[in-house]
């Protein structure tokens, strides 16, 4: 919402996760992984690389099906904590101008800094208006003092805001999974938030610094090259 | 029970104005957008437009714009729907129906519907 | 405007057989389509939402299939209960919020 087209595949590392339709964005972070959204589960999934209109072939695409789709352990379907999911391509992505990977976090978000949140979600904050081509929109990220202060009791330290208290700027349905970058590193998932781009209701990011050992591990345990010592 | 209770039957004049009411009861009054859909005698349904109960913000049919208001007193868990400058082609029952799924939800892509209907309104205008 | 059109009109069926009903959308609307049935006095009933989730209480007899511009209800066994005009909707661009003309199930 309140956002801009995208210049054609200069989000390289977006995925649209596809079940028959667009339902989730993603991250790739390596040729053969993907972060997205815990709440974005489901247990077919198309990932969809490459992409810029997504109702149009345009020659750039790679369309390759999930192998694996690993929630995190401690996903809570009622608040939302954990809210992140890993996925394993069948076969690596080719990595390309187009198609590539984004770096995992060094350091914890920090407030102010600027961030790039990217997707094919609604660009209406009251109705529905679901676009083709990909959306960006460069919002700051807000300190956790305003994060709680907007969703008293609802923010856990699995999770940050981003975006306007004013309103009017924001990712919403159909943005979920997709990334959040901040400095070349994917900071946050999108997740959640009441209704979108309203006034003091921010919208609430997965904190993929918290999750980095998860990640390593989960693709170590999941990898065919395992080493025994 | 989740149940939505309209106000009664209402007969105008041409160039009056209607306002019917929708009662919620048994969820967060709050939590879903409410949407206001009319049907004329024997015709099929029209969308009239939307509120959302939390924050006031509406949506309306183009149809309808400057001729429609729609509000909500959150204290009583009620939406409104005035409809002005009646005509005789405005006769038709009108109901209030809400969206199944909570206000808070992830932002996946989600399917929406009206999970719950009023029993709707008759207005009639006639001379 | 994503137009709604359902077809056919009218389906004269008999009651034990099975009803296919027919709704087309202008432009892709993605998964988010809803059937409603309705009788005669009263206010719509919600059937199947997200194409092909029935809601709650509804029958296994009723079922969605379909995305993107087509889409289709199937009753697979008509009951008496069953006579009624259906209506499908668009969820996905709004405003306006759009239905289908309707289609009346009729006794054979």
């Known amino acids: 919402v309140g956002g801009y087209i995208c210049e054609e595949n200069s989000v390289p590392y977006q995925v649209s996760l596809n079940s028959g339709y667009h339902f989730c964005g993603g991250s790739l972070i390596s040729e053969q992984w993907v972060v997205s959204a815990g709440h974005c589960y489901k247990s077919r999934i198309q990932v969809r690389l490459g992409e810029h209109n997504i109702e149009v072939l345009e020659g750039n695409e790679q369309f390759i099906n999930a192998a694996k789709i690993i929630r995190h352990p401690k996903y809570n379907s009622r608040t939302l904590d954990n809210d992140i999911l890993l996925i394993k391509l069948s076969s690596p992505a080719v990595i390309n101008s187009r198609v590539s990977a984004i770096s995992l976090p060094t350091a914890p978000p920090a407030a102010g800094t600027e961030s790039l949140i990217s997707g094919w979600g609604n660009t209406l904050s009251s109705g529905a208006d679901y676009p083709d081509e990909l959306q960006c929109l460069d919002a700051p990220v807000l300190s956790q003092a305003e994060c709680e202060a907007s969703y008293p009791g609802k923010i856990t330290n699995n999770m940050f805001c981003v975006g306007f208290l004013e309103g009017g700027k924001d990712s919403c349905q159909g943005d979920a999974g997709g990334p959040v970058v901040s400095n070349g590193e994917l900071q946050g998932i999108v997740s959640w938030g009441y209704g979108c781009a309203q006034k003091n209701r921010p919208g609430v990011y997965t904190k993929v610094y918290n999750y980095v050992d998860w990640i390593k591990d989960t693709i170590a345990a999941n990898s065919h090259h395992h080493h025994h010592h | 029970q989740v149940q939505l209770v309209q106000s009664g039957a209402e007969v105008k004049k041409p160039g009056a104005s209607v306002k019917v009411s929708c009662k919620a009861s048994g969820y967060t009054f709050t939590d879903h957008y409410m949407h206001w859909v009319r049907q004329a005698p024997g015709q099929g349904l029209e969308w009239m437009g939307a509120?959302?109960?939390?924050?006031?913000?509406?949506a309306y049919a183009q149809k309808f714009q400057g001729r429609v208001t729609m509000t909500r007193d959150t204290s009583i868990s009620t939406a409104y729907m005035e409809l002005s400058r009646l005509r005789s082609d405005d006769t038709a029952v009108y109901y209030c129906?809400?969206?199944?799924?909570?206000?808070?939800?992830?932002?996946?892509?989600?399917?929406?519907?009206?999970?719950?209907w009023g029993q709707g309104t008759m207005v009639t205008v006639s001379s | 405007e994503i137009v709604m059109t359902q077809s056919p009109a009218t389906l004269s069926v008999s009651p034990g057989e099975r009803a296919t009903l027919s709704c087309r959308a202008s432009?892709?609307?993605?998964?988010?389509l809803a059937w409603y049935q309705q009788k005669p006095g009263q206010a719509p009933r919600l059937l199947i939402y997200?194409?092909?989730t029935r809601a709650t209480g509804i029958p296994a007899r009723f079922s969605g299939s379909g995305s993107g511009t087509e889409f289709t209800l199937t009753i697979s066994s008509l009951q008496s209960e069953d006579f009624a005009v259906y209506y499908c909707?668009?969820?996905?661009?709004?405003?306006?919020?759009?239905f289908g003309g309707g289609t009346k199930v009729e006794i054979k």
């Open positions: 432009q892709s609307v993605g998964s988010n």
């Open positions: 909707q668009q969820f996905h661009n709004w405003p306006p919020l759009t």
């Open positions: 997200g194409a092909s």
């Open positions: 129906a809400r969206v199944g799924g909570a206000a808070r939800v992830g932002k996946a892509y989600t399917a929406s519907a009206f999970d719950i």
């Open positions: 509120i959302n109960p939390s924050s006031g913000g509406t």
